[in-house]
């Protein structure tokens, strides 16, 4: 079941998943000057069964000048924001990721892919946050968010992370320096 909205935005932080649950969509987005091919998929889909999962469909980009019913316009000016979704940096692959049943690995990049990946997550997905370069992480608890189904509605738990403007970066799980977390795992459940 798809999550109704996106994971929470944390100022000066980005998030990523270590693996993607079956049913996850990854939009086929192309970099500026390119677009999905006319007969190209809208998204890639993590599909399969408990023993083997893989990405269905392939994203393909072509020059946007090649099709007369596609236009490229200059977007309205807006404030520059930190990217909140997975950026195309070198993806970090935990060694055990492939062995997670019902999950897909980070898909390899496709030619002329956009710099930012847009995922549609499913219930049960967990994402991990890290501060962007130049910001330091202050943890009150886990720097993660989980999409949960509560009373027929989906929602993301609130990650316990604050990024402060000090020149030190925090890493994703597996590369993180141990930090004291005196409080227990914070409950961000909401009653209804």
């Amino acid at each position: 079941e798809l999550c109704d909205d996106d994971p929470p935005e944390i100022p000066h932080a980005t998030f990523k998943a270590m693996a993607y649950k079956e049913g996850t969509m990854l939009n086929c987005e192309c970099k500026r000057g390119f677009r999905r091919i006319k007969s190209g998929s809208l998204y890639m889909l993590c599909t399969g069964n408990s023993s083997h999962s893989s990405w269905d469909n392939q994203c393909q980009c072509t020059s946007s000048a090649t099709r007369n019913t596609t236009k490229q316009v200059t977007p309205q000016p807006e404030e520059q924001k930190e990217r909140k979704t997975t950026e195309m940096q070198s993806p970090m692959q935990p060694v055990d990721q492939a062995s997670l049943p019902g999950h897909c690995r980070e898909p390899p990049p496709w030619e002329n892919e956009a710099t930012e990946r847009i995922y549609h997550f499913v219930v049960g997905q967990m994402v991990y946050y890290q501060c962007v370069q130049g910001y330091r992480a202050l943890h009150r608890g886990p720097a993660e968010s989980v999409c949960k189904m509560t009373h027929g509605k989906t929602r993301w738990t609130q990650p316990q992370l604050i990024c402060t403007g000090e020149m030190e970066t925090s890493q994703f799980p597996g590369e993180e320096k141990p930090q004291a977390s005196p409080e227990g795992r914070p409950e961000s459940e909401t009653s209804c």
Epitope: L2, D4, D5, D6, E9, G23, M25, N27, E29, C30, R32, R35, K38, S39, G40, S41, L42, Y43, L45, T47, D56, N57, S64, T70, K71, Q72, V73, T74, P75, Q76, E78, K84, T85, A114, E116, I118, H120
Partner: antibody
Framework: QVQLQQPGAELVRPGTSVKMSCKAA????????IGWVKQRPGHGLEWIGD????????NYNEKFTGKATLTADTSSSTAYMQLSSLTSEDSAIYYC???????WGQGTLVTVSA | DIQMTQSQKFMSTSVGDRVSVTCKAS??????VAWYQQKPGQSPKALIY???YRYSGVPDRFTGSGSGTDFTLTISNVQSEDLAEYFC?????????FGGGTKLEIK
Amino acid sequence: QVQLQQPGAELVRPGTSVKMSCKAAGYTFSNYWIGWVKQRPGHGLEWIGDIHPGGGYINYNEKFTGKATLTADTSSSTAYMQLSSLTSEDSAIYYCVSRNFANWGQGTLVTVSA
Amino acid sequence: DIQMTQSQKFMSTSVGDRVSVTCKASQNVGTNVAWYQQKPGQSPKALIYSASYRYSGVPDRFTGSGSGTDFTLTISNVQSEDLAEYFCQQYNSYPWTFGGGTKLEIK
């Protein structure tokens, strides 16, 4: 929660144009395509086109090229569709959709009448 | 353009029954098919994506199946609130196209 707000109705004269809005809330507007769908009784649903507010791309169904013009304003998280040279054939409900068709607006009923 | 054909415009069923709404694509669309439910006076609601995956909040009595050119939306244990029109849609190739709709009537 994701919401797409559209005005309920527009009454317009033949030969004129109309510009309808779709205000998005509850998600990052610039990340997702916004599409437009036409519904007329007996004609089912027709996809008009879509726009990527962040990337600035627009795709049109060739049937609506010259009829519909799609724009988006990221500062107000609002998408717009302008329909020109209106005739009775343009009387319909127009829906905006987003997040891979997961979310639909309530629709704007356009009535073209003298 | 790819045509999506829902051959049955109307289907009649009873509460508790199982009903299957079918949709045929004019060419192979893989599993790039969605199903929508539209109740009278309301906007369409997304039920199924990628032929067989349910959106959140959609009861599990709604099941999608098929690939290639033939697709089915099955409603098991039909409830009175399922009275609606059901549309299929392909998003395999521009322009995205919809089926003509199947109206489900409850006896």
